[in-house]
């Protein structure tokens, strides 16, 4: 979480945003909230990021405008207009990109004052895996795919009956690039398991962290995924 | 400190190519766009080209738009410039320049290298 | 493209004496103007940004004025490391313009 605060001049007003992860192509959310006003003819929301020649999205006087947005932002932002006036100034991002990784800025301007606060937004691919039985291997064999992965993740096997143990030795992981050539599909795979145990198939890389458990017993096989975002720190 | 050193430059024939390059230091490289400016001889200065600090957009001018390519390294901080079909009227002194952090609120072109001539010439 | 036209494109003057130069942009570019100096055989030196924001290490006899399209830059006392030439540089759209040029010369 970043607070930010005004400068000089008018009354500085408080500014919120929170460091946030985008799934390329996908669309991804910018989060900034600040000190509402009574009237959204006097709220403009500039939305920045570094190193950019022109501006992410401005919204004044009630409306978009974009005369002076960035090319690479051209058709992609929208801010939530309804709930402006109620101090959301987050802005909605589609079909994010890699290169929309970076420093982004939320500059407010009230009747009350000015205020800014600064979110970092990464961006990478990140999906939930799924573990089943292979039932072609000659041994129980475990099989964890994720279609879609970026930058490239770690994989990690664990058991619930032997807690500790390392895998790595009974485990082989592959990276197979999609057809965009730039995110990738995980398999791994899990040799020698042993029924009435729970494994669980973990993928992480600096964005974002995934599980898929599966217990496989005589009569069942239960599974669960979760997927969770890392590093999101509000400012 | 700040510095930005071109090299590449030299003598072409009209049709070839020519990469530039432009080694920065001294400031977070990729919190930057930059720029490239050209002045041919005792002429004004002429802004060429942008790119933006992660290396998603890029700007040319009307003059070497579909012949100038701009791009950046942010692992080696470094700029560079692909001319390509040059023409006797691409002769000048190419300068690589600092642009903008953010927009409205920071200086830009506060820091220049010092040149690199490219003459275009049969 | 936004156009800049200074002017005048040349003039002499004396060491102390004020020394103003105008351009003026095709169409607004709100505040985005800059001002360089430049010596020959040398790299342009920003001077002014913002239209009026002095760059630092910039003597205040250098002064920059003006918003939308007309802009001025004004040397109060002319001094000898002063003559040069001068250029605006607009940066309110994604390319930057630059104008003509001003050569400032002893008289």
């Known amino acids: 979480l970043i607070i930010g605060f005004g400068i000089s001049g008018r009354h500085s007003i408080t500014v919120t945003t929170v460091a946030s992860a985008g799934n390329i192509g996908e669309d991804g959310i910018l989060s900034c909230t600040f000190e509402p006003d009574i009237k959204l003819s006097d709220i403009v929301i500039q939305w920045l990021k570094e190193g950019v020649l022109g501006l992410v999205h401005e919204f004044k006087e009630g409306k978009d405008e974009l005369s002076e947005q960035d090319e690479m932002f051209r058709g992609r932002t929208a801010v939530f207009a309804d709930q402006v006036i109620v101090g959301n100034a987050s802005l909605r991002l589609k079909n994010v990109q890699l290169t929309d990784a970076g420093t982004y800025k939320c500059y407010i301007i009230t009747s009350k004052g000015k205020g800014n606060a600064n979110l970092e937004y990464k961006t990478g691919a990140f999906s939930m895996p799924e573990v089943n039985v292979d039932y072609n291997a000659s041994s129980e064999t475990l099989r964890c795919e994720a279609p879609r992965w970026f930058p490239q993740p770690t994989v990690v096997w664990a058991s619930q009956v032997d807690q500790g143990a390392n895998f790595s030795e009974v485990s082989n992981t592959s990276f197979e690039l999609n057809s965009e050539n730039v995110t990738m599909k995980v398999v791994s795979v899990l040799y020698n398991v042993t029924i009435n145990n729970t494994y669980s198939c973990m993928i992480e890389n600096d964005i974002a962290k995934a599980t898929g458990d599966i217990k496989v017993t005589e009569s069942e096989i239960k599974r669960r995924s979760h997927l969770q975002l890392l590093n999101s720190k509000a400012s | 400190e700040v510095q930005l050193l071109e090299s590449g430059g030299g003598l072409v024939q009209p049709g070839g190519s020519l990469r530039l390059s432009c080694a920065a230091s001294g400031f977070t490289f990729s919190s930057y766009a930059m720029s490239w400016v050209r002045q041919a001889p005792g002429k004004g200065l002429e802004w060429v080209s942008a790119i933006s600090g992660g290396g998603g957009s890029t700007y040319y001018a009307d003059s070497v738009k579909g012949r100038f390519t701009i791009s950046r390294d942010n692992s080696k901080n470094t700029l560079y410039l692909q001319m390509n079909s040059l023409r006797a009227e691409d002769t000048a002194v190419y300068y690589c320049?600092?642009?903008?952090?953010?927009?409205?609120?920071?200086?830009?072109?506060?820091?220049w290298g010092q040149g690199t001539l490219v003459t275009v010439s049969s | 493209d936004i156009q800049m036209t200074q002017s005048p494109s040349s003039l002499s003057a004396s060491v102390g004496d004020r020394v103003t130069i105008t351009c003026r942009a095709s169409q607004s570019t709100r505040s985005w103007l800059a001002w360089h100096q430049q010596k020959p055989g040398k790299a342009p030196k920003l001077l002014i940004y913002k239209a009026s924001s002095l760059e630092s290490g910039v003597p205040s006899r250098f002064s920059g004025s003006g918003s939308g399209t007309d802009f001025t830059l004004t040397i109060s006392s002319l001094q000898p490391e002063d003559f040069a030439t001068y250029y605006c540089q607009q940066y309110g759209s994604y390319s930057r313009t630059f104008g003509q040029g001003t050569k400032v010369e002893i008289k």
């Open positions: 320049a600092r642009d903008i952090q953010w927009y409205g609120e920071s200086t830009l072109f506060d820091y």
